[in-house]
Amino acid sequence: AGVFELQIHSFGPGPGPGAPRSPCSARLPCRLFFRVCLKPGLSEEAAESPCALGAALSARGPVYTEQPGAPAPDLPLPDGLLQVPFRDAWPGTFSFIIETWREELGDQIGGPAWSLLARVAGRRRLAAGGPWARDIQRAGAWELRFSYRARCEPPAVGTACTRLCRPRSAPSRCGPGLRPCAPLEDECEAPLVCRAGCSPEHGFCEQPGECRCLEGWTGPLCTVPVSTSSCLSPRGPSSATTGCLVPGPGPCDGNPCANGGSCSETPRSFECTCPRGFYGLRCEVSGVTCADGPCFNGGLCVGGADPDSAYICHCPPGFQGSNCEKRVDRCSLQPCRNGGLCLDLGHALRCRCRAGFAGPRCEHDLDDCAGRACANGGTCVEGGGAHRCSCALGFGGRDCRERADPCAARPCAHGGRCYAHFSGLVCACAPGYMGARCEFPVHPDGASALPAAPPGLRPGDPQRYL
C-alpha cells in the first residue's frame, strides 16, 4: 500500500500566440479545482474508463475575478497536494489524467456550475520511493506544470510497495523464514497481509491483498460454505451456483428449504429464507450460535452464546432478513436517468438505457448528429437516438442529397403554373386569380378578396404576398 502524490505548480496560458480567454469574469467570478485519475499500465484508455489505481479531487482554489484589459495570468491554485492512496502493489508503469475544472460562483439555481477547462493525459514509468518527477503538459492554449511521486506507507517498502518490513523483535535475527529488509537491515520482512476480512480459518494468500479459499469454502472472503447437501433426482446438468438442480417443474416444488424455511424462485434456481437459528443453502445448518458467524454481509450477531439461545443479527445498512442475507431494493430511488431501467445485481446497480442514451446511469445523451453530415447546407437535428436533416431550400431526402422539386406538391391554386426558382418557386396565376399561390380571386369590379389589411396599413396601400 502507498500514496501517489501530485503537486500542481501552475495553470495558465501556454507559450506562443493565441492566449486563452480568462475563464472567469467580473460578472462571473470563478475558482479552479483539479481531478486526477490513475490507471495501471500504459493503457490508452478512454477518459471515462474507471480509474483503477484511484482518483482524487483537490480543494477549491481562491476565487478569481478577471481584471478587464489585463492578460490572463497564471490562475490562483488550491493549496496542498492531491493524494491518491493505492491499496495493493504500485504497478511501476501507469497512465494519468489530470483535469482542470472551473466552478462558476454566480447565482446558479441548484448550486454552482462546473465545467471542464482542460484535460491532460500521459503514460509514465515511476518507481515508488523515488524523488519527485517534474512535468509540463499542454491542453490547447493552456499549460499545466506539476510534480508527482509514489511513496509506500509503512510497513510496505520497495519500488512496488510489496515488501513488508517491521522492526525486529529480537536484536540478532529475524523470525523463521523471514529475511532482513534491505536497505533497512534493522528491520525484518513481515508475513504477507491478505485481503482485509479474509477468513483466517478458511482463506489464505500468496500475494498481498488476495484471499484464496480452502476447499469447501467460497465467497470473496472465504466465509461462505459450499453446499454439500445431496441432490434428489437431478433434473438436468448440475448448477454452478447450487451444486444441483431441484426436481419437479419449479425450483420451489416440494419446498427444498428445511426447518421451516420459505422458498422463493430466483432466475437461476431458488433461495431459502431461514428462520432464526438455521442457515445454509436449504436452512439445513442448525444449532447455530454467534460463534458460527450466522450473520452475513457484515451483520452484527447478538445473543446466541449457546445452541439453545437464539441469536439476533443486527444488519448493516443495505441488508435485511434474519441473517442479513437480503438486499434492500435500491432501485426504488430510481437512480437511472432518461427512462433507464434499474437492475440491482447485488454487487452493483446497473442501468439498461433507452435508445439514444448511454453511461452507467444513462446520463449521456448520445450525439445523434456526431459524424452525420447533412449535404447541401442542411442542418442536423437530434432527437431520441435518431437524427434527421433539416434541408436547405431546394433539397430533400434523409441526408439532403436529393434535389427537391418545389413544384411536386402542386402548390399553385386555381390552375396556376408552377416554376422552380433558385429561391423556391413562383406561381404564374390563371386569369382571375392572384397571390403568391394564386389563392385569391380577383372580383369583376377590380377589387380583390385580399385579407383585411394589417394594422398600420390603409386598404389602398400596396401589399406584398410572397
Partner: nanobody, 120 residues
C-alpha cells in the same frame, strides 16, 4: 470512501414534527440520487422520499402531503421535514445516496440510521 451522516431523529408525540438531515462527504464527484428509507421493526425497508437520478422528487404514498424532502447542493445535504407524525412512522430512518465517485464509478451508500419514535 463516502460517509453519510444522519441527524435529527428523536421522540415526538403524534401530530408533531421533526427534521432529519443527511450530509454526504468523502470522495464525491457528484450525487446522482439521494433520499430517505425507513425500516420499522419486523418490516422490510422502504423508500420514504428521494431525489431520483433525473432530479425529480419521489414520495411513498403514506407520507405524501406530510413529509417534504429538500436539499442543499452546495453542502451535499438532504433534509426530510416530517410533520403530522403518526405512530406508524416510528422506524429507523436511513439516508441513501447513489454517488459518482472521483474515479467516475457510481456506488450506492447507506447511512447508519437515525431512530424516529412517535408515541403519546
Amino acid at each position: 470512501e463516502v460517509q453519510l451522516v444522519e441527524s435529527g431523529g428523536g421522540e415526538v408525540q403524534p401530530g408533531g414534527s421533526l427534521r432529519l438531515s443527511c450530509a454526504a462527504s468523502g470522495s464525491i464527484f457528484s450525487i446522482n440520487a439521494m433520499g430517505w428509507y425507513r425500516q420499522a421493526p419486523g418490516k422490510q425497508r422502504e423508500l420514504v422520499a428521494g431525489f431520483t437520478g433525473d432530479g425529480s422528487t419521489k414520495y411513498a404514498e403514506s407520507v405524501k402531503g406530510r413529509f417534504t424532502i429538500s436539499r442543499d447542493n452546495a453542502k451535499n445535504t438532504v433534509y426530510l421535514q416530517m410533520s403530522s407524525l403518526r405512530a406508524e412512522d416510528t422506524a429507523v430512518y436511513y439516508c441513501a445516496a447513489d454517488v459518482q465517485l472521483l474515479n467516475s464509478d457510481y456506488e450506492f451508500y447507506w447511512g447508519q440510521g437515525t431512530l424516529v419514535t412517535v408515541k403519546p
